[in-house]
Interface confidence: low
């Protein structure tokens, strides 16, 4: 089943997030992703846990998953590079770089997103945008078109409270509020964008969604700048 959902959001403006990617397994949406360079998509390492021998591809330039759109193109994956320290049983280092079979053809609806290199926390309360094609309600309805929601960043101390994530949020992770509006699982790999810059990637650890005491967890890309650069080099 696809990993991910946007809860309490709304349909995104078509093609207004040209960096948005759908990581697909055997032709079906699996996870979100974000185009960070012409030939590279950043996603979450846990997304490929269930991939086994399936065919992994990346869809770019899409708003609707099913409808013909002039900008849509499905790319094969040449190489999948999970972070070397990612492990199945933790949310740490949950990053994956996918090298496309060729450079993406850039256009109005396909364009890399600048990512944060300055390793400094986003100010609590900052409104950030998260988008994805995951299910939109607890009944499991899957959207055909891209959904998004604006979420305020939550400070790490609050997120680490015993009632919340109980110390699991390291300096390499960040949180966003989850009161009825939330990302979940397989929006996993999708971007958390603050001020037009990629700040976080939705983690794919399982957690209850839309519960304010279980904030959304995002991997801070700035904390992994050296690794990203080394892979893209």
């Amino acid at each position: 089943p696809p990993r991910g959902r946007i809860l309490g959001g709304r349909e995104a403006e078509a093609h207004a997030r040209p960096y948005m990617a759908s990581v697909q397994l055997n032709g079906a949406h699996l996870c979100g992703g974000v185009l960070v360079a012409e030939q590279w998509v950043l996603s979450a390492a846990h997304c490929l846990e269930d991939a086994a021998d399936g065919k992994v591809q990346v869809l770019l330039g899409a708003h609707s998953l099913s409808q013909p759109e002039p900008s849509k193109r499905l790319y094969d994956v040449l190489r999948a590079v999970p972070h070397p320290d990612s492990q199945p049983d933790t949310i740490d280092h949950d990053l994956l770089l996918l090298q496309l079979s060729e450079k993406a053809t850039l256009g109005p609806a396909v364009r890399p997103l600048p990512w944060q290199r300055v390793d400094r926390d986003v100010a609590p309360g900052t409104l950030c945008d998260v988008a994805g094609w995951g299910i939109v309600n607890h009944a499991g309805r899957r959207p055909d078109s891209l959904q998004h929601v604006l979420l305020p960043v939550l400070d790490r101390a609050t997120c680490n409270r015993r009632t919340h994530h109980d110390g699991a949020i390291t300096e390499r992770l960040m949180c966003a509020e989850s009161n009825r509006r939330d990302s979940c699982k397989g929006d996993s790999g999708g971007p958390l964008v603050c001020g037009g810059v990629l700040e976080g990637v939705v983690t794919s650890g399982s957690r209850v969604c839309g519960n304010r005491k279980k904030p959304g967890i995002y991997t801070r890309v700035a904390s992994y700048a050296a690794w990203i650069d080394s892979v893209l080099a």
Epitope: A14, H63, P68, E69, P70, S71, T105, G107
Partner: antibody, heavy 122, light 107 residues
Framework: EVQLVESGGDLVKPGGSLKLSCAAS????????MSWVRQIPDKRLEWVAI????????YYPDSVKGRFTISRDNAKNTLYLQMSSLKSEDTALYFC???????????????WGQGTSVTVSS | DIVMTQSHKFMSTSVGDRVSITCKAS??????VAWYQQRPGQSPKLLIY???TRHTGVPDRFTGSGSGTDFTLTVSNVQSEDLADYFC?????????FGAGTKLELK
């Protein structure tokens, strides 16, 4: 057979308004992005507006932004261009164009109508 | 805006000849370039997209090449029906922009 038939072109005074229509047939209109492109008397082509298949995404060049509005009625298979605050430099032949769904994607235009003529002059 | 420059407004050729029409982009557009043919009194027709892919039904005497900033449309074994205006277009970013056109005419 794909057909795009424009109408609504006319002689209008500077500052005036005009609404162009494009009747589409021979394909599933709601499945395609559409644009208006104009050709000025020296034959140059200028793209003036784009609409996604459900009109949730529209875009304009600076030359017409705030003056032109593209819209569509998928039930009527019709694309529109509402033009206001018209200037003499808007004088042109206006084409309705379709954006194909190519396996490789892209904002190219695979079908063009025959055009409708707009003249802005006092 | 990305400016597409077609340096030759006119090009003279003879039936059976080979002719190359060039187009230069003001910045890197990858291969997001299309070519259109406009015969006298008609609307433009798509010939080539992604710089080198022929559109359905386009004769193989039309060939596109190039990437980055320099693009070429080559017509080999020119036929009388090829005498027309040719326009390049970039679609790597908004606004979508066209070259000013090159008119292919008989010597």
């Amino acid at each position: 057979e794909v057909q795009l038939v424009e109408s609504g072109g006319d002689l209008v005074k500077p500052g005036g308004s005009l609404k162009l229509s494009c009747a589409a047939s021979g394909f599933t209109f709601s499945g395609y992005g559409m644009s208006w492109v104009r050709q000025i008397p020296d034959k140059r082509l200028e793209w003036v507006a784009i609409s996604s298949r459900d009109n949730s995404f529209t875009y304009y060049p600076d030359s017409v932004k705030g003056r032109f509005t593209i819209s569509r009625d998928n039930a009527k298979n019709t694309l529109y261009l509402q033009m206001s605050s018209l200037k003499s430099e808007d004088t042109a032949l206006y084409f309705c164009t379709r954006h194909p769904y190519l396996p490789t994607g892209g904002y190219v235009m695979d079908y063009w109508g025959q055009g409708t003529s707009v003249t802005v002059s006092s | 805006d990305i400016v597409m420059t077609q340096s030759h407004k006119f090009m003279s050729t003879s039936v059976g000849d080979r002719v190359s029409i060039t187009c230069k982009a003001s910045q890197d557009v990858g291969t997001a370039v299309a070519w259109y043919q406009q015969r006298p009194g008609q609307s433009p027709k798509l010939l080539i997209y992604w710089a080198s892919t022929r559109h359905t039904g386009v004769p193989d005497r039309f060939t596109g090449s190039g990437s980055g900033t320099d693009f070429t449309l080559t017509v080999s074994n020119v036929q009388s029906e090829d005498l027309a205006d040719y326009f390049c277009q970039q679609y790597t970013s908004y606004p979508l922009t066209f070259g000013a056109g090159t008119k292919l005419e008989l010597k």
